[in-house]
């Protein structure tokens, strides 16, 4: 039988990339467990991660039901074993998370250059359209299908022999750029949602250079 009182969770933080969404909190539990609830502003509280000793809970399954909704989570603390609870009048201790709107706030994952193809003095660069965990009619949607024209990609490209970078933008997943014949170029892309106020840009993709496996060259 213990005497350590139950404490409320704190530092509730949303960690979300391409809609994969995890709620994290502190402290590591001592003689207590947690249960998480999630709700939309107009919806009901749904419990997840029951009686867990983890300090994180994957809420992806709930938020992908409607990524444009605003969600709130709360973390309940319950005494483990025969430990006293500090809740007043038998009410359980809980702490609310900040609000979270996946469509506006999920981080954009690092993009990947799928391929590039040179035809004469033109190069077509294709960005991989990553699949998300957002479903529609039973199938998983890609990032482009979720964000549509809200999502743009910025291409950074430069001659292998120099450091001067050029940029191009597209609201599809393809770029068609002019290059100098006989020169090798390197490419990196970044996902951007210009309309956002936070988490507007992804990290840059890995650099891909002509003359390596991903490229194709045709006269």
């Amino acid at each position: 039988s213990g005497t350590t009182n139950t404490v409320a969770a704190y530092n509730l933080t949303w960690k979300s990339t391409n809609f994969k969404t995890i709620l994290e909190w502190e402290p590591k539990p001592v003689n207590q467990v947690y249960t998480v609830q999630i709700s939309t502003k107009s919806g009901d509280w749904k419990s997840k991660c029951f009686y867990t000793t983890d300090t994180e809970c994957d809420l992806t399954d709930e938020i992908v039901k409607d990524v444009k909704q605003t969600y709130l989570a709360r973390v309940f603390s319950y005494p483990a074993g025969n430990v006293e609870s500090t809740g007043s009048a038998g009410e359980p201790l809980y702490e609310n998370s900040p609000e979270f709107t996946p469509y506006l706030e999920t981080n954009l994952g690092q993009p990947t250059i799928q391929s590039f193809e040179q035809v004469g003095t033109k190069v077509n660069v294709t960005v991989e359209d990553e699949r998300t965990l957002v479903r529609k009619n039973g199938t998983f949607l890609t990032l482009r299908q979720v964000f549509g024209k809200d999502l743009i990609y910025t291409l950074y490209y430069w001659k292998s022999s120099s450091s001067g970078k050029k940029t191009a933008k597209t609201n599809t997943n393809e770029f068609l750029i002019d290059v100098d014949k006989g020169e090798n170029y390197c490419f990196s892309v970044q996902a951007v949602i210009p309309s956002r106020t936070v988490n507007r840009k992804s990290t840059d993709s890995p650099v891909e250079c002509m003359g390596q496996e991903k490229g194709e060259f045709r006269e």
Partner: antibody
Framework: QVQLVQSGAEVKKPGASVKVSCKAS????????MHWVRQAPGQGLEWMGI????????VYAQKFQGRVTMTRDTSTSTVYMELSSLRSEDTAVYYC??????????????WGQGTMVTVSS | DIQMTQSPSSLSASVGDRVTITCQAS??????LNWYQQKPGKAPKLLIY???NLETGVPSRFSGSRSGTDFTFTISSLQPEDIATYYC?????????FGGGTKVEIK
């Protein structure tokens, strides 16, 4: 097949303690929570608490806090429920029930056969 | 604690009848509700989980639905082997709680 086998009936005096066992077989013991539920004669079902067999963490209904202790022995895939300071109103059938799979969160999909505990002076 | 008010407490119906049992939660429990069948002298058996999902191996004449805090359990065509007591159980809030039960008998 998946089953939970409980220990036999007990008769106890008021103030005594009883310890009921529940042996699991046919599945990975550590992967599912175990619950204890009791049923007084002619009455409904009452949840007592839960034990996570992988770490031994327990959570009890407040009504039983301080009187109940749930433990487990991973080497024999057995969980135990001990209830102390027995009184006549603790006379009931005590069930262990498996729960906590990812599909059916806290639904009790497998039950023990029940252990009748009679508290009488 | 969340109160689960189950009604009726007992009912008598004929073989082939449609039987409906309701369970009302004292506050919002989302779809975190299960239904069990308990035959005399036996342990309960899970029939429906998460308000409307049929447990594997359970006959399709059993079904469940939700409307807000009201939950309905239906036997579409009562069979003699369905004589039992039926319980709802919520798990959205600690502690987990059961309804008082509905005893189903054959006329």
């Amino acid at each position: 097949q998946v089953q939970l086998v409980q220990s036999g009936a007990e008769v106890k005096k008021p103030g005594a303690s009883v310890k009921v066992s529940c042996k699991a077989s046919g599945y990975t013991f550590a992967n599912y929570y175990m619950h204890w539920v009791r049923q007084a004669p002619g009455q409904g079902l009452e949840w007592m608490g839960i034990i996570n067999p992988s770490g031994g963490i327990t959570v009890y209904a407040q009504k039983f806090q301080g009187r109940v202790t749930m433990t487990r022995d991973t080497s024999t895939s057995t969980v135990y429920m001990e209830l102390s300071s027995l009184r006549s109103e603790d006379t009931a059938v005590y069930y262990c029930a498996r729960g906590g799979s990812k599909v059916a969160a806290l639904a009790f999909d497998i039950w023990g056969q029940g252990t009748m505990v009679t508290v009488s002076s | 604690d969340i109160q689960m008010t189950q009604s009726p407490s007992s009912l008598s119906a004929s073989v082939g009848d449609r039987v409906t049992i309701t369970c009302q939660a004292s506050q919002d429990i989302s779809n975190s509700l299960n239904w069990y069948q308990q035959k005399p002298g036996k342990a309960p058996k899970l029939l429906i989980y998460d308000a409307s999902n049929l447990e594997t191996g359970v006959p399709s004449r059993f079904s469940g639905s939700r409307s807000g805090t009201d939950f309905t359990f239906t036997i579409s065509s009562l069979q003699p082997e369905d004589i039992a007591t039926y319980y709802c159980q919520q798990y959205n809030f600690h502690p987990l709680t059961f309804g008082g039960g509905t005893k189903v008998e054959i006329k």
